[in-house]
Interface confidence: low
């Protein structure tokens, strides 16, 4: 028996079609993804197979102003119009608070909503009880297919879920909901979820009767043959790992952005074990028409989303420096507003000995692309904070030992003078070069925040410490030539939206007004 | 479709100065660098120096300073070089081309002007 | 200043084949790598840039390859209007450095 998996991960709110980096698309025919093209390809697919299910692996949630404005509504919408058939919770769906996952997505999603290692307690358990759930058995055919769901555990440290749901690991949630399965003579079982490659490999290995993992977290992109775009495949797709007892289970992901379809067909024999499995993802690219009538769809939610972009956040009081001219040279007042925000957005109270997780942000200057002029009436909108961050990234946690982040600053100014990006802006740390040392040699003090004081206050760095660190997914990913990060950071987990998060930063504070106060010196 | 079109050949005496231009459409002007490269057969190219039109900032290569002056107009999208103290070794085709400011590669060129330094 | 070496000023090749053209920093360039065709009497014309990113209207024939101090153009199948210099340049640190080129004739 033959059963075409088609799956996505990571989508982050890329409803419309991108460019080939996942950006806001400029020249259409050269553009990917978007729903409208997913449905192409997944309705060409079903019309031509007969066993097919369409998955998704968590995060839909958090990427463009797509998710700003309509808050999840968009994602049950388009989901359910494209008749998905299950999807994993990620992290990213927590991060409007646990409501604003029940009202917009649960209580509005037409396909099952899964995660076997989230636990309910107190009033939510009843409030949320059967709007998700650990597994759900979908007839496929002639047979039935058991999908298990599961999320990462690190998700109250990336996001907010509040103090009612428990996050268990994910290994041990999942063994007995597949036993529980097995009970119920499925045969044929998928973990869908959402906690990273190497979970997924883990899951595999250790979970006793999981036949297939459709994971997401990681971006990971997968592939067999010469690969059609700029992703580089970390391994082959799909890729096998060996059970401890024995089975050859196949682990696939598809990338982030709906960019691609991930498309998997696994033979079955008559007692569910799987014979083979092959496939690849699916580049949707503009070779595959997007459908009129999603399109159409599309273009009516599109019309709120340009009336929102000029509307007014806040206010600044000062002038927002947001040029080359400060923010690659010196300490600019944009680059601590950034910063500012990107902690504020990170504020998860999980521990009395912590008075947060994170205390430290780096923000390369040449991420900064504009100024905001206060003299217009002190107005700042979405428009506004595009031009000053065009590039639709975001603003990722990492664990970096303090060794990696002395490099990262002596990187910050090893050829200063050149108006380069790699100058970085500061949160939560305390910097002071002297350039009349050689390049490597020219941090002279480098102080970062205590986070486990209940009186934040600034201690030198230690070299084998390990830290916490909010930084764009281009620092994380070794851009500017930070590649010292890339290749020594720890831990590695996404985050928002980096217009989302000084968005939301500003509509709070209401009234801004961010000063240089002395984070970056020059002795 | 950017467009860069550059000043015609010059024949000009040892110690004198020279100023071409390169006058630019089809874009923007304010937004990209415009780059100055010299091509020698025995030097190959050189660039020396670029200046950005939207906030006049210039970078020169130091082989260049004080040899090539880099200026603006931004009411007629043209840029200026202006080379001083001529000797035989600035006998060259100098190019101008234009570059983002983050990602100094040069997508558009100009024909190039000769200039001959003899007396 | 970060020096760019292609090796052998002159290539002799013959057409269809296929020609590997190098180019070496003297440092690491974090991918910041150009690779322009110049024909005489013309301005140099961009190829490639960012190692890899082909730019509109370049024949796929072209590719890019390459990471640290080590860079490639490649052609696959060499065309009569592809006789020509190559030069690569580095965008990674001022002032901006092109290679001495590399003369493709045809034997």
């Known amino acids: 028996w033959e059963l075409t998996i088609l799956h996505t991960n990571d989508v982050h709110s890329r409803l419309e079609q991108t460019s080939e980096d996942s950006s806001k698309c400029v020249n259409a025919s050269r553009c990917m993804g978007g729903v409208a093209r997913l449905f192409t390809k997944v309705q060409q697919i079903r019309r031509a197979e007969p066993n097919v299910l369409l998955l998704d692996a968590g995060d839909q949630y958090q990427g463009t102003i797509w998710f700003t404005v309509y808050k999840g509504a968009e994602v049950a919408h388009f989901m359910n119009a494209l008749r998905y058939d299950a999807m994993a919770l990620g992290n990213h769906e927590f991060d409007n608070g646990v409501e604003g996952l029940i009202e917009p997505l649960l209580k509005e999603a037409k396909f099952p909503i899964l995660s076997a290692n989230i636990k309910a307690k107190g009033p939510l358990a009843s409030q949320i009880s059967g709007l998700y759930l650990p597994y759900k058995v979908l007839p496929v055919g002639d047979e039935v297919v058991g999908i298990v769901g599961y999320t990462s555990k690190e998700t109250p440290f990336l996001s907010n879920p509040g103090t009612n749901l428990v996050f268990e690991d994910e290994i041990t949630a999942l063994q007995p909901e597949v036993d529980k399965l097995k009970t119920l003579n499925v045969n044929k079982i998928i973990a869908l979820g959402h906690s990273g490659f190497e979970m997924d490999k883990l899951i595999a290995q250790k979970v006793r009767g999981v036949d297939v993992v459709v994971g997401g977290h990681s971006n990971t992109f997968l592939y067999t043959g010469n690969p059609p775009s700029k992703e580089v495949p970390a391994g082959k797709y799909p890729f096998i790992v060996t059970s401890d007892d024995g089975r050859k289970v196949p682990v696939v992901q598809a990338y982030a952005f709906g960019k691609y379809l991930g498309y998997l067909k696994i033979e079955f024999d008559e007692r569910g074990n799987v014979i083979s499995s092959h496939g690849n993802p699916i580049l949707l690219n503009s070779s595959i028409p997007e459908d009129p009538s999603i399109k159409a769809d599309i273009n009516k939610w599109r019309i709120k989303l340009d009336n929102y972009s000029t509307q007014e956040l806040g206010k600044t009081i000062v002038y927002l420096d947001g040029s080359s001219q400060s923010c690659r040279f010196r300490e600019c007042n944009m680059g601590n507003l950034i910063c500012d925000a990107m902690i504020n957005n990170n504020l998860r109270h999980t521990d009395e000995m912590f008075w947060n997780h994170v205390s430290m942000c780096i923000l390369n200057g040449g991420g900064i692309r504009s100024p905001i002029d206060e003299r217009n009436n002190g107005t700042i909108t979405w428009e506004n904070l595009a031009a000053v961050l065009p590039f639709g990234g975001t603003f990722d946690l990492v664990q970096l030992k303090g060794s990696t982040l002395k490099k990262a600053f002596e990187h910050s100014v090893h050829r200063y003078g050149q108006s380069t990006g790699e100058f970085l802006q500061v949160g939560g740390i305390h910097v002071v070069y002297d350039l009349s040392r050689k390049p490597g040699d020219r941090v002279v003090k480098l102080d970062v925040l205590c986070t486990k004081c209940r009186v934040p206050s600034y201690d030198p760095l230690k070299m084998d410490e390990v830290y916490k660190v909010i930084l764009p997914n281009f620092l994380a990913n070794g851009g500017d030539g930070f590649q010292m990060i890339k290749d020594e950071l720890l831990r590695h987990d996404s985050g928002d939206q980096d217009i989302n998060v000084v968005s939301t930063y500003i509509s709070k504070m209401k009234v801004i007004y961010p000063a240089v106060e002395g984070r970056i010196k020059f002795s | 479709q950017a467009y860069l079109q550059q000043s015609g050949a010059a024949l000009v005496r040892p110690g004198a100065s020279v100023k071409m231009s390169c006058k630019s459409s089809?874009?923007?002007?304010?937004?990209?660098?415009i780059h100055w490269v010299k091509q020698t057969p025995r030097q190959g190219l050189e660039w020396i120096g670029a200046i950005f039109p939207g906030n006049g900032h210039i970078s020169y290569n130091q082989k260049f300073k004080g040899k090539a002056t880099l200026t603006v107009d931004k009411s007629s999208n043209t840029a200026y070089m202006q080379l001083s103290s001529l000797t035989s070794e600035d006998s060259a085709v100098y190019f101008c081309?234009?570059?983002?400011?983050?990602?100094?590669?040069?997508?558009?060129w100009g024909q190039g002007t000769t200039l001959t330094v003899s007396s | 200043d970060i020096q760019m070496t292609q090796s052998s000023s002159s290539f002799s090749v013959s057409l269809g084949d296929r020609v590997t053209l190098s180019c070496k920093a003297s440092?690491?360039?974090?991918?910041?790598l150009a690779w322009y065709q110049q024909k005489p009497g013309n301005a140099p014309r961009l190829l490639i840039s960012g190692v890899i990113s082909l730019e509109t209207g370049v024949p796929s024939r072209f590719s890019g390859s390459g990471s640290g101090k080590d860079y490639t153009l490649s052609i696959t199948s060499l065309q009569t209007e592809d006789v020509a210099t190559y030069y690569c340049?580095?965008?990674?640190?001022?002032?901006?450095?092109f290679g001495g080129g590399n003369k493709l004739e045809i034997n």
């Open positions: 089809g874009y923007t002007f304010t937004t990209y660098n």
């Open positions: 340049q580095q965008y990674w640190s001022i002032p901006w450095t």
């Open positions: 081309a234009r570059g983002d400011y983050d990602e100094s590669y040069f997508d558009y």
């Open positions: 440092e690491g360039i974090y991918n910041r």
